[in-house]
């Protein structure tokens, strides 16, 4: 049987190194050897691939080496497959070396900001030594912020002026570390070089970008003053490296600026004590280069009716995220503030908040929340400077079985009845939403019975017991992950009732 006709011939010119062609089939059933015929010097000359017998057999690749690699040039390549039964020739393929030239990657030697030019990095690199001197090279510059996995790209071309080349990358974020890598190719080539080694550079620092500002309104104190916990953080989109030296706060009752109070702090939270009127609060951050834009917050009067527009809310888990969605009756509201914090018996130690715009859902990665912890999530509608009534829900990113079962006691023991009472498991030990409770009880040497009740029931009356009999009993609390038994208690039914 003749060998298969060589097909899918693909050639690449590694500049000043070799001209390599590959083809299929890569393996033949019987021993096959290949001859690659090339014409070069624009069809004036020809030769055959200089592979020796030891590598030629069943090897669907062949390289032509200098000095017969001419450039620029057009080559033809034809592959002949031969076995004991005969020869099969491929079609003749035509190759323009400029179109298939692959060169070394460039070498970036500096990525620096230019003094006084904001949001720009100047990349300097050395053009590859092994690249045609006269040709225009096309480049792809890839860049990303140091903590991002997402690359951005910019394409440009450079004439051969000098071996040292520069490119100014603009419209970057201020005071941000960027990773750069560069590749190149002759302008006409379909093959890019590999990527250069990555180089890091940082854009110049600027005045702070801005602040996101929020508050927690606490109940009024006996003297009528209202504690308001202010909190702020770098605005979304602010440079990662940005550091503020401090924060200026000023606030005053609405329409009464002459009662302005000012505070300076280096913390990102501050408690104010306000009267019952409406107040306006302003916060700026500053560094050695200036101040951020002002963040503004309106604190409503104590007696102000707040609007309500969230009708329903759902929290659901995807593979790696917690997604909270809500429905609103107010289409004009397009900004929402989401608060979340662990639901613990004591004052929550960590309180988080985030603004959502042009969406009615909020997503957080599961690994940002602790498993087995219950989180309170509240969403506030924000319409211009007014904050509406929140809608709240609770969620676990991962449920487990409770760390402890319910503490149980037997009350009102009768001849054939008993009332069982149990305490709620402390929040810190629930590890999930308690779905139900199951009471397991068993007479001495008798069969075990069980009764399951809803999670809102903390007391149950067992009936049809046997007179003057010892029973053991325990209550199991269950989450979606499973159940945990409480301590086992024993009781004995009476032999005679009071009525008897």
């Amino acid at each position: 049987v003749l060998p298969a006709k060589p097909e899918n011939i693909s050639c690449i010119f590694y500049y000043e190194e070799n001209f390599t062609c590959t083809w299929s089939p890569e393996k033949e059933a019987s021993y096959t050897w290949y001859k690659v015929k090339r014409t070069y010097s624009y069809g004036y000359k020809s030769d055959i691939c200089s592979t020796d017998n030891s590598t030629r057999g069943n090897h669907a690749s062949c390289s032509f080496l200098p000095p017969t690699i001419t450039n620029p040039d057009n080559y033809t390549i034809q592959v002949e497959a031969q076995n004991a039964d005969g020869i099969m020739k491929s079609d003749i393929t035509y190759w323009n070396l400029d179109a298939i030239m692959k060169i070394e990657p460039p070498e970036i030697f500096s990525v620096k900001s230019v003094l006084g030019i904001k949001r720009m990095l100047q990349i300097k690199w050395i053009r590859p030594v092994l690249a045609p001197h006269s040709s225009t090279l096309k480049y792809t510059l890839r860049f990303r912020t140091i903590n991002s996995a997402y690359w951005m790209e910019v394409n440009f071309t450079k004439e051969d002026i000098d071996r040292d080349e520069t490119y100014n990358l603009t419209e970057l974020q201020a005071f941000t570390e960027y990773v750069m890598t560069l590749r190149c190719a002759p302008a006409e080539s379909m093959f890019w070089s590999g990527w250069s080694q990555e180089k890091v550079g940082t854009t110049e620092e600027e005045a702070p970008y801005g602040l996101d500002l929020w508050r927690v309104l606490k109940p009024a104190m006996v003297d009528g003053r209202r504690p308001v916990q202010l909190m702020w953080k770098k605005a979304t989109g602010a440079p990662v490296l940005e550091k503020a030296l401090g924060y200026n706060i000023w606030y005053f009752p609405e329409n009464n600026t002459n009662l302005t109070e000012t505070v300076n702090t280096t913390n990102q939270t501050h408690e104010l004590y306000l009267g019952g009127k409406t107040y306006w609060v302003y916060v700026v951050s500053y560094n050695s280069l200036g101040e951020s834009p002002v963040a503004t917050l309106r604190i409503p009067a104590l007696n102000e009716k707040t609007f309500q527009c969230i009708e329903a809310m759902q929290a659901c888990l995807t593979q790696d995220q917690l997604v909270v969605e809500w429905q609103s009756s107010a289409p004009e509201v397009d900004t929402w503030m989401v608060e979340w914090f662990p639901d613990v018996d004591s004052e929550p130690s960590s309180f988080s908040w985030e603004s959502v715009s042009q969406a009615r859902n909020w997503t957080i990665q599961k690994d940002e929340l602790k498993p087995l912890w219950c989180y309170n999530i509240s969403v506030y509608p924000v319409l211009r400077d007014r904050v509406g009534q929140p809608y709240s829900t609770q969620a676990y990113v991962q449920e487990g079985i409770p760390s402890a079962g319910p503490v149980t006691q037997a009350d009102s023991i009768g001849v054939k009845t008993v009332t069982i009472t149990w305490k709620e498991i402390p929040k810190s030990k629930r590890n999930g939403f308690i779905k139900n409770y199951t009471i397991f009880y068993q007479a001495e040497d008798g069969k075990e019975f069980s009764k399951t009740v809803n999670s809102n029931i903390l007391q149950y009356r067992l009936e049809s017991l046997t007179r003057r009999t010892s029973y053991s009993l325990q209550v199991m609390a269950s989450t979606n992950a499973g159940g945990t038994n409480g301590t086992k208690i024993n009781f004995k039914t009476l032999s005679i009732s009071v009525l008897e």
């Epitope: 014409t39 010097s41 624009y42 069809g43 004036y44 000359k45 020809s46 030769d47 034809q78």
Partner: antibody, heavy 117, light 113 residues
């Protein structure tokens, strides 16, 4: 249409010089290797010389090396053959040819060169 | 350096088939492509076969080229001979030793009426 027109032939004495020209039209002259091929009366074809696209590389048969010079002017789309120290065995019809892929795809009509005393 | 050897003459009757061989003296016939030219008396040559077996579009499909490794030769075959096929035929290949083309001595084809 591709056209190659030779000129400059004639009768010349042995030891003297002669320059042949070949005017090309109908194709991008600078993209092709070009050649001179001769044919002595009642004899076969014999390659004389070839030149690369830009003129940087030239190739000659042994019997004319050092006596003949092939050149080209891409701006004028013209191929030349400068023949010095001519011998009687150089008597032939000289054809200008365009190189295709290892063959001559177009030929001129030929010009006669007679070397005789 | 190799030579290409052709028979001085070949003849065939009208509408018959003839084959002109072209034998390479040294090296493998398959190492470089072979071309064939037809030359009528007093006219320049014209190419009839290139790269072993390819035919220019304007050439009749009665002309075909082939390579035979066992005899280390190329062949030009003309079928259905016509009177106009009477001409000289030359084979040609590339010799890397001289860095140039090599022609065979030529074969005179006579078509018998």
């Amino acid at each position: 249409e591709v056209q190659l027109v030779e000129s400059g032939g004639g009768l010349v004495k042995p030891g003297r010089s002669m320059k042949l020209s070949c005017a090309a039209s109908g194709f991008t002259f600078s993209n092709y290797y070009m050649a001179w091929v001769r044919q002595a009366p009642t004899k076969g074809l014999e390659w004389v010389a070839s030149i690369s696209t830009g003129g940087g590389n030239t190739y000659y048969r042994d019997s004319v090396k050092g006596r003949f010079t092939i050149s080209r002017d891409n701006a004028k789309r013209t191929l030349y053959l400068q023949m010095d120290s001519l011998r009687s065995e150089d008597t032939a019809t000289y054809y200008c040819g365009r190189h295709g892929t290892l063959y001559f795809d177009y030929w001129g009509q030929g010009v006669m060169v007679t070397v005789s005393s | 350096q190799f030579t290409l050897t052709q028979p001085k003459s070949v003849s065939g009757s009208l509408r018959s088939t003839i084959t002109i061989p072209c034998e390479r003296s040294s090296g493998d016939i398959g190492d470089s492509y072979v071309s064939w030219y037809q030359q009528h008396l007093g006219r320049p040559p014209i190419n009839v076969i290139y790269v072993d077996d390819q035919r220019p579009s304007e050439v009749s499909d009665r002309f075909s080229g082939s390579i035979d490794s066992s005899s280390n030769s190329a062949s030009l075959t003309i079928t259905d001979l016509q009177m106009d096929d009477e001409a000289d035929y030359f084979c040609q290949s590339y010799d890397s030793n001289i860095d140039g083309p090599v022609f065979g001595g030529g074969t005179k084809l006579t078509v018998l009426g």
